[in-house]
């Protein structure tokens, strides 16, 4: 094949190979962007920035190589439109550092930095960390920083990400009120913070004020809805991110509903509660006080994070006769109290009837396995009597 | 498949508390199942001592209630009865097992009340 | 009364059928569950809840009940039901649990 005359010629299927000395100033306008996977520049001395606008369009691009170039700065989001990123080579360079932002949001297998004038500073103590976990292929570069000795020598005590404070009121919150939430940040270097409020919806009314450091939350007219809802502050220095959750009790009163008895491998009365703080649960059977035995029992379903209503059941292992009745549940707590009846028949009598009287109808047995709870049946091929009710 | 083992001392002297656990494993004691001891005194019949549910629920055969304490650690994934005040009368084979079937039992563990 | 009453001792001839009782008066109210045990060996669940048997179980074990009498049937016997058998159940007031005396089998 006949040599490429271009400032970038093709290589491979999908790549770009980009070799002519001072050919390049900026990567607008590739040919072929779309496609390529692998790129590959060297010599490019006027090649110094590389930022967000540059790699747009790249989005199937998983090696960079840029060497023995000029290349200054690299942009906190230069890689935000190259996800798939897994090898970056930015050996000889004129590098004195990298922001950790620009390699966040990457799964990189391969960081080449060896080469470059690196500063040792703040800054780079996250590739200082990645240095003494072995990320990334930089333990074998044995970085070093311009007149300074090794990257892993770099003092690293006062390096710390924002430290986030985050005062909640101490008070009860109830339904309607306005909420002030504070966020105090520490830390050197502070370059951005703010609050993370995607959970909220409509849980309440949003005003933001204040800025570093000290950002301010208004949620006015909170419903209860706001409970188990994450409300984060976060904060952005040289070495890092910081992120606090909290979470506001909205308080509001117990209550309570009772859906008709299924059988499943057991008798299950649903149920749900919900109010906050959680109420107390009580039963009442036939309106006395209903003592939970491994026969009978409360049985919660796993609760979901972010919402305060629990499920469950009253659950009942193979209830005759004598669990017929009006089931009650009771719920409280500081804020109110609800109760909820219903009425459950499991069998008539199968103990006791009159030979002359239509055979009953038996619920028939469920094949169960023992990781439920109930031992493994074997079912029966042989119809049994009227009178067979035990066992 | 669930496993049950009984643990803990095989002599106590009278007037002490006897001490057993039971490990679960195969299962999660957490799960919808409450668990159980019984107790079987040489050549004798078994008797039921107590049952427990993961959230603390417990219930005791009266005729033990004052002297049994039956608990449960998640983190173990075993529970554990206490029995005060022991006399000849609580030697016994003790089991523990899954209730309320008792479709899984513990090999059983001999529990001496000896001075 | 928080009692199931067993007789002591039952004896069947190899293949015949023999029927085992639990009396109490917490039997008209629960169902009773059947263990049968071995020397030297943990009680085995052989019947349960409304006539339900564990796997593993053979069907010529099988439970039945009338008033305040549980019985476990045993049709065929083999030699390998020689054993003590024990009935439990529910006590009246629901809140504990009671077991019979026990019923030892002997197969001739």
């Known amino acids: 094949a006949a040599p490429c005359p271009d400032a970038c010629c093709p290589h491979g299927s999908s790549g770009l190979r980009c070799t002519r000395d001072g050919a390049l100033d900026s990567l607008h306008h590739l040919p072929g962007a779309e496609n390529l996977t692998e790129l590959y520049i060297e010599n490019q001395q006027h090649l110094q920035h590389l930022e967000l606008r540059d790699l747009r369009g790249l989005g199937e691009l998983r090696n960079l190589t840029i060497v023995k170039s000029g290349l200054r700065f690299v942009a906190p989001d230069a890689f935000h439109f190259t996800p798939r990123l897994s090898r970056l080579n930015l050996s000889f360079n004129a590098l004195e550092s990298l922001s950790w932002k620009t390699v966040q949001g990457l799964s990189l297998q391969e960081l080449v930095l060896s080469g470059n004038p690196l500063h040792c500073s703040c800054a780079l103590r996250w590739l200082q960390r990645w240095e003494e976990e072995g990320l990334g292929g930089v333990p074998e570069q044995k970085l070093q920083c311009h007149g300074q000795g090794p990257l892993a020598h770099m003092p690293n005590a006062s390096c710390g990400v924002p430290t986030l404070k985050v005062q909640v009121p101490n008070a009860s919150v109830d339904v309607g009120d306005d909420v002030l939430l504070r966020c105090q940040v520490e830390g050197r270097g502070l370059e951005q913070a703010g609050w993370i409020l995607t959970e909220l919806e409509q849980s309440a009314t949003v005003m933001k004020s204040g800025g570093l450091p000290s950002l301010g939350l208004t949620l006015a007219n909170v419903t209860s809805d706001l409970n188990r809802k994450n409300v984060t502050c976060w904060a952005e220095n040289d070495v890092g991110r910081a992120e606090v959750s909290v979470q506001v009790n909205v308080s509001f009163p117990a209550s309570v509903q009772l859906h008709t008895a299924v059988e499943m491998h057991h008798w299950c009365i649903p149920f749900s509660v919900d109010g906050q703080p959680a109420p107390s649960l009580r039963w009442l059977f036939n309106g006395s006080v209903l003592n939970e035995t491994s026969f009978i029992f409360t049985e919660f379903l796993e609760p979901a994070a972010n919402e305060t209503v629990r499920h469950g059941c009253l659950r009942l292992n193979q209830p005759t006769h004598v669990n017929n009745g009006n089931y009650t549940l009771l719920a409280a707590n500081p804020f109110g109290q609800a109760s909820a009846s219903i009425m459950a028949a499991f069998m008539d009598n199968p103990f006791e009837f009159n030979p002359e009287d239509p055979i009953p109808v038996s619920f028939s047995p469920v094949d169960t396995n023992s990781t439920s709870g109930d031992p493994v049946e074997k079912k029966d091929e042989t119809p049994f009597g009227v009178s067979v009710a035990v066992g | 498949e669930v496993q049950l083992q009984e643990s803990g001392p095989g002599l106590v002297k009278p007037s002490g508390t006897l001490s057993l656990t039971c490990a679960v494993s195969g299962g999660s004691i957490s799960s919808s199942n409450w668990w159980t001891w019984v107790r079987q005194p040489p050549g004798k019949g078994l008797e039921w001592i107590g049952e427990?549910?993961?959230?603390?629920?417990?219930n005791y055969n009266p005729s033990l209630k004052s002297r049994v304490t039956i608990s449960v650690d998640k983190s173990k994934n075993q529970f554990s009865l206490k029995l005060s005040s022991v006399t000849a009368a609580d030697t016994a084979v003790y089991y523990c097992a899954r209730a309320p079937w008792f479709d899984y039992w513990g090999q059983g563990t001999l529990v001496t009340v000896s001075s | 009364s928080s009692e199931l009453t067993q007789d002591p001792a039952v004896s069947v001839a190899l293949g015949q059928t023999v029927r085992i009782t639990c009396q109490g008066a917490?039997?008209?109210?629960?169902?009773a569950s059947w263990y049968q045990q071995k020397p030297g060996q943990a009680p085995v669940l052989v019947i349960y809840g409304k006539n339900k048997r564990p796997s593993g179980i053979p069907d010529r074990f099988s439970g039945s009940s009338s008033g305040n009498t549980a019985s476990l049937t045993i049709t065929g016997a083999q030699a390998e039901d020689e054993a003590d058998y024990y009935c439990n159940s529910q006590a009246s007031s629901g809140n504990h649990l009671i077991f019979g005396g026990g019923t030892k089998l002997t197969v001739l």
């Open positions: 917490s039997l008209r109210s629960y169902y």
């Open positions: 427990i549910y993961h959230r603390g629920n417990r």
